[in-house]
């Protein structure tokens, strides 16, 4: 028995084709991806095989101005009108708190919306019970096929779940769910979750029962052969683990942002056990035409969009000088605003021990493109941060020793003086730079908030210890060349659209007034 | 909040096709498994098949061969027909949802009020 | 098909009382098991699935225990609105199937 296996992954909000790099389309000719192009690709696949589930493993929240306005009730909306079949949540859904998850997405989903590893209690429990399941079974032609969901474990840490969801370790949930599954006599069973590549292939090695992994979260991309666009492949599609009970077990991703359809095909045998599996992403290129009923139904929802983007947000009293002669050579008040904007976006429960998780952010000056007159009445609009924040970033959490830090200053003034965008503007850190030094060893000082602490202060950075830092998803990934983040985090997760933290702050604050308070010298 | 209705003839003569059809409203017909029962007069119930909402049917062993269960999701609801029928179908037909923490069709809630269908000639 | 068994067929009892009803699988069916509540002309009501999980909105005074073949529904300290006919229900394998029923009536 063959099933084919179309799966997505952290969409985040592109509804909308995009360019190539997954940010806003420019040149129609050349964009990729969207939920019209998918629905056609989909459609086709449908039509030309049997036994077909369409599959996404979250992280459909969070990433464009479709997200801000419609809050999630835009995902439902498309997943239903391209019937997906099932969905596992991510961290992202916990965005707006569990009632931004359970009124537009949750009550509203035609499909059912999986995790295994969080658990309801107090008076949350009644509440979302039978909203979300750990498993589904579904039937699939004359089959039937079990889908278990997992989350982000990280996620109380990553959103904004609140105190009455548990996440559990997501192998020790999983374990208990796939033997009842298998009490039921369902015998093929797919694991659809969204922790990251890792623990996609722990899963795969350490559940027993799981016959399949779709995954999510670490946006990686998988492929056999050729690959057809920019993205590098970490491995193959699909990556075989080898299970602990001996069995070979495929784990696919699918990249991010809706650019690729993963497709997969298992052959079963009559007891459920994987004989075969093959396939490779789809590139959702120019080549597949989008259906023009979903077309149609974006271009209505769209209006909503247009409207939003020139009502003010908030108002500065203050110039927000964006400028590349302020940003990428000093402290500049709009650095300082994007930083203080990303650490509010990261303020989580606090307990007797941290007053939080996360106190310092970085932010390379080349990301800053447009200052803010406050002559106009003071009025900030989203079309306004769109041109401070033009390229459709998120804001991420990484984790990195105080030794990468170091060098991650260094090298943000080891060319001082050439308007490079490697100046790196801050929040929760103190540096100071001492220019008539050679490079690579200009840093001679640097202060760091302390988290673990009930009044926060300036502490030396201790070279060994772990830091988390909040900076761009750019930095994240070496841009700029930042090569050591790349190269010696120790734990990066993504975050929110750029634009949206700040929007979300301003809103917030309702008026602002940074500052430039030396926290660059 | 869910609510089915059953509607159809409370009437049908032997040999003939039973008909039914069970409207849901409050909630969305595609992610749940839809279940016909029904209950002799004095008896106790049994499982007639499921649909779920996206089009896939399961039988009782013992009806099969004259059991159709169907769905029309842009009029949220799902029908039984019943073919050959006797007095020994005469009963009270429920439809029910699978409960919300259901997995696979394991157990039903909500259920539809219930129609009373005599089958005599 | 799995045959389900209820003992007793009928049960006489007093406000206040705590009455138990048993019901048996012809084979294991795990934890797949749930309780209904009939009154006459109306619908089940689901009070208990997965053998002891209880439904929303139904008072604590039900209770569900039992796994594999065996299972118990307890009403500890029966109410005048108990008084009506319940049913076992296995969940584990198709075709789902009820037991006969079990009439609680004023003693």
């Known amino acids: 028995w063959e099933l084919t296996i179309l799966h997505t992954n952290d969409v985040h909000s592109r509804l909308e084709q995009t360019s190539e790099d997954s940010s806003k389309c420019v040149n129609a000719s050349r964009c990729m991806g969207g939920v019209a192009r998918l629905f056609t690709k989909v459609q086709q696949i449908r039509r030309a095989e049997p036994n077909v589930l369409l599959l996404d493993a979250g992280d459909q929240y969070q990433g464009t101005i479709w997200f801000t306005v419609y809050k999630g009730a835009e995902v439902a909306h498309f997943m239903n009108a391209l019937r997906y079949d099932a969905m596992a949540l991510g961290n992202h859904e916990f965005d707006n708190g569990v009632e931004g998850l359970i009124e537009p997405l949750l009550k509203e989903a035609k499909f059912p919306i999986l995790s295994a590893n969080i658990k309801a209690k107090g008076p949350l429990a009644s509440q979302i019970s039978g909203l979300y399941l750990p498993y589904k079974v579904l039937p699939v032609g004359d089959e039937v096929v079990g889908i278990v969901g997992y989350t982000s474990k990280e996620t109380p840490f990553l959103s904004n779940p609140g105190t009455n969801l548990v996440f559990e370790d997501e192998i020790t949930a999983l374990q208990p769910e796939v033997d009842k599954l298998k009490t039921l006599n369902v015998n093929k069973i797919i694991a659809l979750g969204h922790s990251g590549f890792e623990m996609d292939k722990l899963i795969a090695q350490k559940v027993r029962g799981v016959d399949v992994v779709v995954g999510g979260h670490s946006n990686t991309f998988l492929y056999t052969g050729n690959p057809p666009s920019k993205e590098v492949p970490a491995g193959k599609y699909p990556f075989i683990v080898t299970s602990d009970d001996g069995r070979k077990v495929p784990v696919v991703q699918a990249y991010a942002f809706g650019k690729y359809l993963g497709y997969l095909k298992i052959e079963f045998d009559e007891r459920g056990n994987v004989i075969s599996s093959h396939g490779n992403p789809i590139l959702l290129n120019s080549s597949i035409p989008e259906d023009p009923s979903i077309k149609a139904d974006i271009n209505k929802w769209r209006i909503k969009l247009d409207n939003y983007s020139t009502q003010e947000l908030g108002k500065t009293i203050v110039y927000l000088d964006g400028s590349s002669q302020s940003c990428r050579f000093r402290e500049c008040n709009m650095g300082n605003l994007i930083c203080d904007a990303m650490i509010n976006n990261n303020l989580r429960h606090a307990d007797e021990t941290f007053w939080n998780h996360v106190s310092m952010c970085i932010l390379n000056g080349g990301g800053i493109r447009s200052p803010i007159d406050e002559r106009n009445n003071g009025t900030i609009t989203w079309e306004n941060l769109a041109a401070v924040l033009p390229f459709g970033g998120t804001f991420d959490l990484v984790q990195l020793k105080g030794s990468t830090l170091k060098k991650a200053f260094e090298h943000s003034v080891h060319r001082y003086g050439q308007s490079t965008g490697e100046f790196l503007q801050v929040g929760g850190i103190h540096v100071v730079y001492d220019l008539s030094r050679k490079p690579g060893d200009r840093v001679v000082k640097l202060d760091v908030l302390c988290t673990k602490c009930r009044v926060p202060s300036y502490d030396p950075l201790k070279m060994d210890e772990v830091y988390k830092v909040i900076l761009p998803n750019f930095l994240a990934n070496g841009g700029d060349g930042f090569q050591m983040i790349k190269d010696e985090l120790l734990r990066h997760d993504s975050g929110d659209q750029d634009i949206n933290v700040v929007s979300t702050y301003i809103s917030k604050m309702k008026v602002i007034y940074p500052a430039v308070e030396g926290r660059i010298k | 909040q869910v609510q089915l209705q059953e509607s159809g003839p409370g009437l049908v003569k032997p040999s003939e096709t039973l008909s039914l059809t069970c409207t849901v409203s409050?909630?969305?017909?595609?992610?749940?498994?839809w279940s016909w029962i029904r209950q002799p007069p004095g008896k106790g119930l049994e499982w007639i098949g499921y649909?779920?909402?996206?089009?896939?049917?399961n039988y009782n062993p013992s009806l099969k061969s004259r059991v159709t269960i169907s769905v029309d999701t842009s009029k949220n609801q799902f029908s039984l027909k019943l073919s050959s029928v006797t007095a020994a179908d005469t009963a009270v037909y429920y439809c029910?949802?699978?409960?919300?923490?259901?997995?696979?069709?394991?157990?039903?809630?909500?259920w539809g009020q219930g129609t009373l269908v005599t089958v005599s000639s | 098909d799995i045959q389900m068994t209820q003992s007793p067929s009928s049960v006489s009892a007093s406000v206040g009382d705590r009455v138990t009803i048993t019901c048996r699988a012809s084979?294991?069916?795990?934890?797949?098991l749930a309780w209904y509540q009939q009154k006459p002309g109306k619908a089940p009501k689901l009070l208990i699935y997965?053998?002891?999980s209880l439904q929303s909105g139904v008072p604590s005074r039900f209770s569900g225990s039992g796994s594999g073949t065996d299972f118990t529904l307890t009403i500890s300290s029966l109410q005048p609105e108990d008084f009506a006919t319940y049913y076992c229900?296995?969940?584990?394998?198709?075709?789902?199937?009820f037991g006969g029923g079990t009439k609680v009536e004023i003693k």
């Open positions: 029910a949802r699978e409960s919300q923490e259901s997995p696979y069709n394991n157990w039903f809630d909500p």
């Open positions: 409050g909630g969305s017909i595609e992610r749940y498994y």
């Open positions: 649909i779920y909402g996206r089009g896939s049917t």
């Open positions: 084979q294991g069916i795990s934890s797949w």
């Open positions: 997965a053998a002891s």
């Open positions: 229900q296995q969940g584990n394998s198709f075709p789902r199937t």
